[in-house]
């Protein structure tokens, strides 16, 4: 099951998501999405990162931790009762079948 | 220590095309990204993209894109940019620097003008 | 593309004034990759603050830097003659990266 993050309707929400980089130093791709993770991507894309920047978001959401460290956590700027539901953070790591995947549940009260 | 030494002042005519060298030193230069910034007189400044030396790998801002190429001589140390079809709009002062923005060359200076 | 939009675009101080310099930015950015930089004519910018609220190497202490999200300050505690400069703002964090348009800061 999911792990249960909160919320109050106007506050900002934060998803945390973390990975160690690799050896080599270089980022790992990574994707914010809407719903539960699929078997690939992310559905519903919010944010994405690539080998060195966030190469795409939508407006009110952010990485405000140090992402090129590993922390991708995922900040909801004036959270409505509509931002509640499951957030995919995936971390797309090279390979067939790697990725790790995290499933958040966002509560908004 | 860091540096970030760029080439001389250019003054070419408009439909022309440049390069700009930035040599870096002290430091291990296929380990870090090198950015390269433009400056029109008396304004801000713009991204124009980065290349990361170690691979190659370059990217721009959509608005540099078929303007400015950028590469790397890994066995020299040293970063260029490269600006075609020159026009007045492309007179600015342009830096490089480095990986986190936390040193930078001191600015080379291209007038285009006919 | 972020914008980031600073404020005022020009102002003068007096010695000993308290001045704070705003940086707004269109879409929130991490806070790790907010840098303020001071630049004098002639010169190339130099890294001033980094990481939202860190002072560079030889900064004075005066200066500080605060914020987070979309709205991000410099603040001098008392103005210096030394301290007249412009003052921009960047982000990057989001590709591509921005600049703000810049503080000229001037002294009475």
């Known amino acids: 099951s999911e792990v249960e993050y909160r919320a109050e309707v106007g506050q900002n929400a934060y998803l945390p998501c973390f990975y160690t980089l690799p050896t080599s130093g270089t980022l790992v791709p990574v994707c914010w999405g809407k719903g539960a993770c699929p078997v690939f991507e992310c559905g519903n894309v919010v944010l994405r990162t690539d080998e060195r920047d966030v190469n795409y978001w939508t407006s009110r959401y952010w990485l405000n931790g140090d992402f090129r460290k590993g922390d991708v956590s995922l900040t909801i700027e004036n959270v409505t009762l509509a931002d509640s539901g499951i957030y995919c953070c995936r971390i797309q790591i090279p390979g067939i079948m790697n990725d790790e995947k995290f499933n958040l549940k966002l509560v908004i009260k | 220590q860091i540096q970030l030494q760029q080439s001389g002042p250019e003054l070419v005519t408009p439909g022309t095309s440049v390069k700009i060298s930035c040599k870096a030193s002290g430091y291990t230069f296929t380990d870090y990204y090198i950015n390269w910034v433009k400056q029109r007189p008396g304004q801000g400044l713009e991204w124009i993209g980065w290349i990361y030396p170690g691979s190659g790998n370059t990217k721009y801002n959509e608005k540099f894109k078929g303007k400015a190429t950028l590469t790397v001589d890994t066995s020299s140390s040293i970063a260029y940019m490269h600006l075609s079809s020159l026009t007045s709009e492309d007179s600015a002062v342009y830096f490089c620097?480095?990986?986190?923005?936390?040193?930078w060359g001191q600015g080379t200076t291209l007038t285009v003008s006919s | 593309q972020i914008v980031l939009t600073q404020s005022p675009a020009i102002m003068s101080a007096s010695p000993g004034e308290k001045v704070t310099l705003t940086c707004s930015a269109s879409?929130?950015?991490?806070?790790?990759?907010l840098y303020w930089y001071q630049q004098k004519p002639g010169s190339s910018p130099k890294l001033w603050i980094y990481?939202?609220?860190n002072l560079a190497s030889g900064v004075p202490a005066r200066f500080s830097g605060s914020g987070s999200g979309t709205s991000y300050s410099l603040t001098i505690s008392n103005m210096e003659t030394e301290d007249a400069a412009s003052y921009f703002c960047?982000?990057?964090?989001?590709?591509?990266?921005?600049f703000g348009g810049g503080t000229k800061l001037e002294i009475k």
């Open positions: 960047h982000q990057w964090s989001n590709s591509p990266y921005t």
């Open positions: 879409s929130g950015v991490s806070s790790s990759y």
């Open positions: 990481s939202t609220s």
């Open positions: 620097a480095g990986d986190r923005f936390d040193y």
